[in-house]
């Protein structure tokens, strides 16, 4: 997801540079996060890209990438599922919407989630 939008931020290039500087200490740094299970809408895609941009900026200033794995983990376990639910439930979604695969960045028209999935208690 984080590499699909806002090319001016050059996230993939910056991540590669950060990792090459820290390679000796962070063997797993360059491993690209696998977000292929997720798909987000345009708004969420931009938000997660902006968030990652800010996180990388802090790491560039501090010259440290030790917190990168935990950031990827937080995205996978918490933020991306939140974004997915937001994108596929009202008020953001009524009927259908376009989601972009986090791995391929390809857009697909999908149906919104049904009531019980959006509001399990209803």
């Amino acid at each position: 997801c984080v590499f699909c939008r806002l090319p001016a931020h050059d996230l993939s290039g910056r991540l590669a540079r950060l990792c090459s500087q820290m390679e000796a200490r962070q063997k797993e740094c360059g491993a690209s996060p696998d977000f292929s299970a997720f798909a987000l809408d345009e708004v969420s895609m931009n938000k997660v890209t902006e968030k990652t941009h800010r996180v990388l900026r802090v790491m560039e200033i501090k010259e440290a990438v030790s917190s990168l794995p935990s950031y990827w983990s937080w995205l996978r376990k918490t933020k991306l599922p939140e974004y997915t639910r937001e994108a596929l439930c009202p008020p953001a979604c009524r009927g259908s919407t376009t989601l972009y695969n986090c791995s391929t960045c390809k857009g697909t028209e999908v149906s919104c989630w049904p009531r019980k999935r959006c509001f399990p208690g209803s």
Partner: antibody, heavy 117, light 107 residues
Framework: EVQLVESGGDLVKPGGSLKLSCAAS????????MSWVRQTPDKRLEWVAT????????YYPDILKGRFTISRENAKNTLYLQMSSLKSEDTAMYFC??????????WGQGTSVTVSS | DIQMTQSPSSLSASLGERVSLTCRAS??????LNWLQQEPDGTIKRLIY???SLDSGVPKRFSGSRSGSDYSLTISSLESEDFVDYYC?????????FGGGTKLEIK
């Protein structure tokens, strides 16, 4: 029991600003979208803004974009409406409402905003 | 924007009478229409969602239906507490839009 309590309404001069709050209780706040709706003195209802569960998506009518900002603080179970460059036509009772699958299911009692010099 | 034209704007009726209020949508909104009730103290309550589904706790005398672009709220037998204001709301697409309201008065 779902409860929504608005506050912050006041008498304000044209061009002024105001921030309304809506305290929510009786449900898991972060799992619902929220909206603001206003009722003008002639009793017309007008939709003002809507925000998604975590605030990623916000929606406004074109006439209010740029002047009004909806936000939420899930940790405090609170919804906000920041209003700026207020005009006399913004005079209304402002209601917050919870958004379920089919738009607004629960409404607050409202807070009164009067814009006058 | 989708215009919701609600009629009548006011209606006088007697206890026990059957009445219908109508909202006409200027564009297709599918079943994305609610009916709201507002009491004299300003309290707003949703009565019907998705055109015809009754909210919990709403008396069975209230019902909703659709015929093309016309949406109706019917009260089968008016009771004293029903003489208040009613509004329709379309939520098919943003901006949400409301009908102008119907004031139901006792004859």
């Amino acid at each position: 029991e779902v409860q929504l309590v608005e506050s912050g309404g006041d008498l304000v001069k044209p061009g002024g600003s105001l921030k309304l709050s809506c305290a929510a209780s009786g449900f898991t706040f972060s799992t619902y979208g929220m909206s603001w709706v206003r009722q003008t003195p002639d009793k017309r209802l007008e939709w003002v803004a809507t925000i998604s569960f975590y605030g990623t998506h916000t929606y406004y009518p074109d006439i209010l974009k740029g002047r009004f900002t909806i936000s939420r603080e899930n940790a405090k179970n609170t919804l906000y409406l920041q209003m700026s460059s207020l005009k006399s036509e913004d005079t209304a009772m402002y209601f917050c409402a919870r958004e379920d699958y089919d738009a607004m299911d629960y409404w607050g009692q409202g807070t009164s905003v009067t814009v006058s010099s | 924007d989708i215009q919701m034209t609600q009629s009548p704007s006011s209606l006088s009726a007697s206890l026990g009478e059957r009445v219908s209020l109508t909202c006409r949508a200027s564009q297709d909104i599918g079943s994305n229409l609610n009916w709201l009730q507002q009491e004299p103290d300003g309290t707003i309550k949703r009565l019907i969602y998705a055109t015809s589904s009754l909210d919990s706790g709403v008396p069975k005398r209230f019902s909703g239906s659709r015929s093309g672009s016309d949406y109706s709220l019917t009260i089968s037998s008016l009771e004293s507490e029903d003489f208040v204001d009613y509004y329709c709301l379309q939520y098919a697409i943003f901006p949400y839009t409301f009908g102008g309201g119907t004031k139901l008065e006792i004859k």
